[in-house]
């Protein structure tokens, strides 16, 4: 049902859904801190623009009695319950910042007449693609998929002279929310990734993964997985690995690889790590002081959601336009705004663009080094290290099919 919005006469409210089920197990207090820090900045920016208005946030908590798994499994109903709560209280703001679980976002989008924008820190799954009033501030699965296809096809770099068309995907069901949807997208038979590959098999058991590492009859040399180095070690241990195996470890929200004193463990030598270009580990604001890198990215997305709303509010107010209109609801896309950690670019569908970085372990220095970067906005790869000190023969990535190329 239509809910009146607290969004006019110089007073603009943000509805923040504080859900017990969340993409990352983050204390809600930290998210509140991020939102409040964002509000201070937005108020200052509006004042600087000569706009004398009030901006506040209302935090909407669920009772947590029914939906208390803490992860995203029971988030679908929690999101709808919160919306019902907002509806009953007639307390809808100009914008909804909140659901981070793909399940809840998808269902809320489906079950409501959204005449207001929805900003999500998460909602990684393909089912949340191409939603007209949804903005996602953490890299969704579609962006990962496009990188992988681009990289698989690349064959004109000094260190990659073969196009690839095959892959194994390791997915055992214990993944974090981001990894779950990233791998889900790769697994889906109708996805762009599956469409572009000639062979793709999902490995669901540890033993399947372990067997492939030395199986002479394997159908691909490339294995994609998602998680951190410790996750890989638990699975792989110190097992021998065929020399033409390439493991692609997707670990987007982790900038530990860029820290000065980090040495790559030996088991990472056959691994290419895909992560995001680092911000700074110097984030020292009240909300980020005690956060792990992943959780900092999550809290940062909440803060940037507030800054994005402030950016759009400022534009509409300066142009004398109404905020409670479909035009405003559909405007949170195809733009760049000044985020907390630098410029943030949203694509035509409201999804954040970023620079992905592919790292390798240097056999000389045992350090992680940047092999290439990929700009999701233009779907383009930029080689960085033209002479990588790889573990693979001739310092080239092997062919993806055993028995061909440098072995």
């Amino acid at each position: 049902s239509q809910v009146s919005q607290n969004c006019h006469n110089g007073s603009y409210e943000i509805s923040v859904l504080m859900m017990g089920n969340s993409a990352f197990a983050e204390p809600l207090k930290n998210l509140e801190d991020a939102v409040n820090e964002g509000l201070e900045i937005v108020r200052g920016r509006l004042q600087n623009a000569g706009l004398n208005v009030t901006v506040n946030a209302t935090f909407m908590y669920s009772d947590g009695l029914i939906h208390n798994s803490g992860d995203c499994r029971s988030s679908t109903c929690e999101g709808l319950d919160l919306l019902r709560k907002i509806s009953n209280a007639q307390r809808m703001g100009c914008v909804l910042i909140g659901p981070s679980c793909t399940y809840s976002t998808f269902q809320m989008y489906l079950d409501t007449e959204l005449s207001y924008p929805m900003i999500s820190a998460g909602s990684f799954g393909l089912s949340c693609d191409y939603k007209e009033t949804l903005t996602r501030l953490m890299s969704p699965a579609r962006k990962l998929m496009y990188f992988l296809v681009n990289f698989w096809k690349t064959n004109d770099l000094p260190f990659k002279t073969y196009s690839w068309s095959t892959s194994y995907v390791y997915k055992n069901g214990t993944e974090t929310e981001d990894c779950f949807w990233y791998l889900n997208a790769l697994e889906a038979s109708v996805s762009y990734f599956s469409h572009e590959l000639g062979f793709k098999v999902v490995l669901r058991q540890d033993k399947e993964f372990q067997d492939i590492l030395m199986d002479h009859n394997r159908k691909s040399n490339v294995i994609i997985m998602c998680g951190g180095p410790e996750f890989l070690y638990k699975l792989k241990g110190d097992r021998a690995v065929a020399e033409d195996i390439v493991i692609i470890l997707v670990d987007l929200f982790n900038d530990q690889y860029f820290e000065d004193n980090v040495t790559a463990p030996d088991y990472m030598k056959n691994v290419l790590v895909l992560t995001l270009s680092p911000g700074n580990s110097l984030l020292n604001s009240s909300f980020s002081r005690n956060l792990s890198p992943t959780k900092r990215d999550f809290a940062l997305a909440y803060l940037n959601g507030i800054l994005l709303f402030g950016h759009m509010l400022k534009i509409f107010l300066e142009n004398g336009e109404n905020i409670t209109t479909p035009k405003f609801a559909h405007a949170f896309r195809n733009l760049t705004f000044e985020g907390y950690d630098g410029p943030v670019t949203l694509d035509d569908w409201g999804d954040v663009d970023s620079t992905m970085v592919l790292l390798y372990t240097s056999v000389d220095t045992k350090k992680y080094k940047v092999l290439l970067t990929y700009d999701t906005h233009v779907n383009k790869t930029y080689p960085v290290d033209m002479s990588p000190t790889f573990t693979w023969k001739n310092s080239k990535l092997p062919n993806d099919i055993t028995g061909r190329g440098p072995q």
Epitope: I41, G44, N48, A49, G279, N280, L282, S288, D341, P343
Partner: nanobody, 119 residues
């Protein structure tokens, strides 16, 4: 109207150091990032360093490892510490703050401070 005032420029020998300051009449450094630019005689104005709200910093290749940008919110001041100065660092240095415009430069400029590196 936001005012930015640079100071700290001067004449210095190659290899020497200077610290530039940019002070604001408002809280602009607490709500937007800030850039230092420089313009050498007969050349285009070029970006030198940026500091964002989070404290994240970026530098042009020409100054990386030699210059450090920092901020003191309590004093509404941003600094540019310049070490190992070279003759090619000679330029007028400007601070640029506020909301980025369509051309990526920010709203407000200071009047500039001259840095001359010469023996």
């Amino acid at each position: 109207q936001v005012q930015l005032v640079e100071s700290g420029g001067g004449l210095v020998q190659p290899g020497g150091s200077l610290r530039l300051s940019c002070t604001s009449s408002s809280n602009i450094f607490r709500i937007y990032g800030m850039d230092w630019y420089r313009q050498a005689p007969g050349k285009q104005r070029e970006i030198v360093a940026t500091i964002y709200l989070s404290g994240r910093t970026t530098y042009s290749d020409a100054v990386k490892g030699r210059f450090t940008i920092s901020r003191d919110n309590a004093k509404d001041t941003v600094y540019l510490q310049m070490n190992s100065l070279k003759p090619e660092d000679t330029a007028v240095y400007y601070c640029n703050a506020g909301e980025p415009t369509a051309s990526s430069v920010r709203q407000y400029w200071g009047q500039g401070t001259q840095v001359t590196v010469s023996s």
